[in-house]
């Protein structure tokens, strides 16, 4: 039975050619987590595996920094970064567990972290 | 130099077994997932099973379920692949490969025939 | 199971021609694909992987893209050497599945 859920940072947003911190935290379970991907869309940004580390896709290595933690920092931010960023964690015994970011990536300087929320 | 080698291929009767090793080197095996692709003479490739670095996760395609068992030894940086009640349509090369990040499969070994006939 | 349709099956080709090969999922895959060459008797070989990431020691003539059902692999001038068989084969789920493979033989 998979009890654990997924904290993220919500819907945020940030500054063109500014950086943002993409978090996601899993709690409520003692699975242990072997995998975590983040992916935008239909893209994989990056893996970050228990026994092999970081892997950051080669199209997205000039701005894209593994952490802090199973974190993933996109750098150099722009308009085109705006969108769905997901969290998927590999985990043992349970399975995978999914957690949401929205990105929204604003031109002017009005840009605020969103609240956190959780997800089943 | 990642090496992978398999062996324990022959001719066996159909409802017969046979377990095939592939010996891993050049790298840290107990890391990785690994994976067991075979192909038929003059077909394309099947994907037979795999089981994760720490043996907790393993898969197997429907057609060899209940039937083939992946293991392996991360003290000897070996892989097996027990196959029992084979059949006339197990008859293939079996490669071993490995599976970094458990999405793509980076290094293959030179395979081993197995062949089902009586 | 996530079926995998290549095409063509097979195609001719010359020495220094542009050659694409498609591969569809049935359903969406994100970008968990990955491209493969074989070579008679020999085992295969990555040439690309998560759909457009280039493998260690392939030529930068070898490119891939897509996302989601359809994916492209591309030569972008055919070598001698890249005769051969490709295949396409989705790590979005279990059972991995390949596609049927594709054949570039010599015009």
């Known amino acids: 039975m998979m009890t654990g859920t997924i904290e993220t940072t919500g819907n945020i947003s940030a500054e063109k050619g500014g950086s943002i911190i993409l978090q996601c935290h899993l709690s409520s379970t003692t699975a242990q987590v072997t995998q975590v991907n983040w992916e935008q869309q239909d893209q994989l940004l990056a893996i970050c595996n228990a026994d092999l580390g970081w892997h950051i896709s080669p199209s997205f290595k000039d701005r894209v920094a593994p952490g802090p933690g199973l974190g993933l920092t996109l750098q150099s931010l722009t308009v085109n970064d705006t969108g769905e960023y997901f969290c998927i964690y590999h985990t043992y015994p349970d399975g995978t567990y999914t957690g949401r970011i929205f990105l929204e990536v604003l031109e002017s300087s009005v840009a605020e972290h969103g609240a956190r929320f959780q997800i089943p | 130099e990642v090496q992978l080698l398999e062996s324990g291929g022959g001719l066996v009767q159909p409802g017969g077994s046979l377990r095939l090793s592939c010996a891993a080197s050049g790298f840290t095996f107990s890391s990785y997932s690994m994976n067991w692709v075979r192909q038929a003479p003059g077909k394309g490739l099947e994907w037979v099973a795999y089981i994760k670095s720490n043996s907790g996760t393993k898969g197997y395609a429907d057609s060899v379920k209940g039937r083939f068992t992946i293991s392996r030894d991360n003290s000897k940086n070996t892989l097996y692949l027990q196959m029992n009640s084979l059949r006339a349509e197990d008859t293939a090369v079996y490669y071993c490969a490995r599976g970094p990040y458990d999405y793509w499969l980076d290094y293959w070994g030179q395979g081993t025939l197995v062949t089902v006939s009586s | 199971d996530i079926q995998m349709t290549q095409s063509p099956s097979s195609l001719s080709a010359s020495v220094g021609d542009r050659v694409t090969i498609t591969c569809r999922a049935s359903?969406?895959?994100?970008?968990?694909l990955n491209w493969y060459q074989q070579k008679p008797g020999k085992a295969p070989k990555l040439l690309i992987y998560a759909a457009s990431s280039l493998q260690s020691g392939v030529p930068s003539r070898f490119s891939g893209s897509g996302s989601g059902t359809d994916f492209t692999l591309t030569i972008s001038s055919l070598q001698p050497e890249d005769f051969a068989t490709y295949y396409c084969q989705q790590s979005y789920s279990t059972p991995l599945t390949f596609g049927g493979g594709t054949k570039v033989e010599i015009k």
């Open positions: 359903q969406s895959i994100s970008s968990y």
